[in-house]
Amino acid sequence: ATKLTEEKYELKEGQTLDVKCDYTLEKFASSQKAWQIIRDGEMPKTLACTERPSKNSHPVQVGRIILEDYHDHGLLRVRMVNLQVEDSGLYQCVIYQPPKEPHMLFDRIRLVVTKGFSGTPGSNENSTQNVYKIPPTTTKALCPLYTSPRTVTQAPPKSTADVSTPDSEINLTNVTDIIRVPVFN
């Protein structure tokens, strides 16, 4: 069984999710990479991807998502700016490696976006939100559509674990043979 871990981010509308996905430098530097959302019972959906081959430090922006692949660092940086409540969900980075199936990079991101400012006593969400106007789209990359001969298993269930600290992880065990197939709307 594969042990899948998540990191949970709780942010306000208007804020930015800024995360990294590490990869093996020698193996995947120029491979095309993608950012996907995983909805319960559905195949992962690709929201944005780098160019093919992936260019070093070249930002690719699709709507409010900005991808930057730092070859020399062995990491894909993903930013989702001006977050909306509807952006809440489970996300992952994958590396395309046709004809093989996409390779998932750990860890997954559980994003929870809430409205406005929390004024509850003791809350650490102690500030008004920032609404940042993003510049027009720069580069768009076409993401390939891959199909798999094998059945796509259901995405892992939404965790009910209480994740209260940044270091907390949700450990999903007994999740076997998850096929990651990026799809379009």
């Epitope: 804020q15 930015t16 995360v19 990294k20 430098l25 062995g74 991101i109 500030s127 940044p166 270091d167």
Partner: antibody
Framework: QVQLVQSGAEVKKPGASVKVSCKAS????????IHWVRQAPGQGLEWMGW????????NYAQKFQGWVTMTRDTSISTAYMELSRLTSDDTAVYYC??????????????WGQGTLVTVSS | SYELTQPPSVSVSPGQTASITCSGD??????VSWYQLKPGQSPILVIY???KRPSGIPERFSGSKSGNTAILTISGTQAMDEADYYC????????FGGGTKLTVL
């Protein structure tokens, strides 16, 4: 609990090298980047670079490229920062720091106690 | 190279509110962290992700952001808050602001 314990103070001559260690405990060493930050007397915090303990790969601030080397020994959960060709300008307190999460580069939630490196002839 | 700009110094009377700014290009789409540094001590993270407080940091510390400017606010400033404060963001590399010396008069 997470702890970063650095090696002791060093006095070096100009032109020499110094190697500072940072021993991590209380967490999985491979999972989080280790950063090195310095503060020279009367100056601000200066980020020097990060080390990915999992791969051993490092990313250095442009200013330090070519004369800083960051390495690790995973068997003893220790990161190292070596600075060569020292000058008096390198007299500073050197800190190691750990990322808050596996999936971010900032912020630095955990810090070592600092190592004073004095460069003097 | 990317730069974050802070005022060199800010003065405040005890019990009053201190505000320290940090500005930088496209800071609006970057997460800002704030650190407190006292002489002879290691830096302490006081704010991350623009406005979150780590556990153990007093509620009087808060963060906000407006456009490309981040603001660290200390309400009801106490003598123990006298320190240097640094903002931080991740551009292609990690960057610290020049630091602001907070003096509690």
């Amino acid at each position: 609990q997470v702890q970063l314990v650095q090696s002791g103070a060093e006095v070096k001559k100009p032109g020499a090298s110094v190697k500072v260690s940072c021993k991590a405990s209380g967490y999985t060493f491979n999972g989080y980047y280790i950063h090195w930050v310095r503060q020279a007397p009367g100056q601000g915090l200066e980020w020097m670079g990060w080390l990915n303990p999992n791969s051993g790969g490092a990313n250095y601030a442009q200013k330090f490229q070519g004369w800083v080397t960051m390495t690790r020994d995973t068997s003893i959960s220790t990161a190292y920062m070596e600075l060569s060709r020292l000058t008096s300008d390198d007299t500073a307190v050197y800190y190691c720091a750990r990322d808050q999460r596996k999936t971010t580069v900032t912020p630095f939630e955990y810090w070592g106690q600092g190592t004073l490196v004095t460069v003097s002839s | 190279s990317y730069e974050l700009t802070q005022p060199p110094s800010v003065s405040v009377s005890p019990g009053q509110t201190a505000s320290i700014t940090c500005s930088g290009d496209k800071l609006g789409e970057r997460n800002v962290s704030w650190y407190q540094l006292k002489p002879g001590q290691s830096p302490i993270l006081v704010i991350y992700q623009d406005n979150k407080r780590p556990s153990g940091i007093p509620e009087r510390f808060s963060g906000s952001k407006s456009g490309n400017t981040a603001i660290l606010t200390i309400s009801g400033t106490q003598a123990m808050d006298e320190a240097d404060y640094y903002c931080q963001a991740w551009d292609r590399n990690v960057v610290f602001g020049g630091g602001t010396k907070l003096t509690v008069l």
